[in-house]
């Protein structure tokens, strides 16, 4: 079954294809895409009650 | 921040055709998912689909057949069609756009459909 | 479609006290070390509004008294202290699997 747009890696997930640096993984269309195209969530306000978590938009190493 | 604003008709009848506009400002449709999701009386919420960054459609198969999601880069608008309505379509609809995880964290504040003869 | 199953239907609580929801999925909504399971609140008259992303994940602007637990099928929302704010629909929602889904929800009010 496809799976929807959780596009990217998280922190503690390794990516499922290699992608370029600047490219990004999108699980839904399930190919490296320019990782401006998809969306991070916002970003924690300093002293934010849980650790914020890399963006999940990472190139890959 | 992303704005989003649900337009279109508020009453259809039955076996017409729905069409909804979402207006975006903040951001460009040409990156992120563009979602549509609807909410019946008695509280459950249905996801419909979406529209991404590249054009690619999802469709939620329960309304495959009557469903189109469309959209118009130039106006940083895009759409929602449903065919054949009839009154179990009678809901308030909602544009949303999930970041990279599929959480959907900003939302129109929905346009209420009612079908009826 | 992966079902999720939220209880209590209906909660009231004291105002300072604990209020604990669940949302049980029909199958491991886990992939790739993320469990893609959220929370959002809705009161009457407005969208729905992310409170929890990945579980455990605080939006941002969302207080600390939110709270997010779980993986796999299991899940849990915590609100403490709850306030009178809080009064609510609390739904969860799956983003593992197409379709993707919501719970029935879970009305929260003050006792």
């Known amino acids: 079954m496809r799976r929807g747009p959780r596009s990217l890696r998280g922190r503690d997930a390794p990516a499922p294809t290699p992608c370029v640096p600047a490219e990004c993984f999108d699980l839904l269309v399930r190919h490296c895409v320019a990782c401006g195209l998809l969306r991070t969530p916002a970003p924690k306000p300093a002293g934010a009650s849980s650790p914020a978590p890399r963006t999940a938009l990472q190139p890959q190493e | 921040e992303v704005q989003l604003q649900e337009s279109g008709p508020s009453l259809v009848k039955p076996s017409q055709t729905l069409s909804l506009t979402c207006s975006v400002t903040g951001d460009s449709i040409t990156r992120g998912y563009w979602n549509w999701i609807r909410k019946f009386p008695g509280n459950k919420l249905e996801f419909m689909g979406y529209i991404n960054y590249s054009g690619t459609t999802y469709y939620n198969p329960s309304l495959k057949s009557r469903i189109s999601i469309t959209r118009d880069t130039s106006k940083n608008q895009y759409y929602l069609q449903l065919n054949s309505v009839t009154t179990e379509d009678t809901a308030t609809y909602y544009c949303?756009?999930?970041?990279?995880?599929?959480?959907?964290?900003?939302w129109g504040q929905g346009t209420t459909l009612t079908v009826s003869a | 479609d992966i079902v999720l199953t939220q209880s209590p239907v209906s909660l009231a609580v004291s105002l300072g006290q604990r209020a604990t929801i669940s949302c049980r999925a029909s199958e491991s909504v886990d992939d790739y070390g993320i469990s893609f399971m959220h929370w959002y609140q809705q009161k009457p008259g407005q969208p729905p509004k992310l409170l929890i992303y990945?579980?455990?994940d605080l939006e941002s602007g969302i207080p600390a008294r939110f709270s997010g637990s779980g993986s796999g099928t299991d899940f849990t929302l915590t609100i403490n202290p709850v306030e009178t704010d809080d009064v609510a629909i609390y739904y969860c929602q799956q983003t593992s699997k197409d379709p993707w889904t919501f719970g029935g929800g879970t009305k929260l009010e003050i006792k």
């Open positions: 990945r579980a455990s």
């Open positions: 949303a756009t999930p970041h990279t995880y599929g959480a959907m964290d900003y």
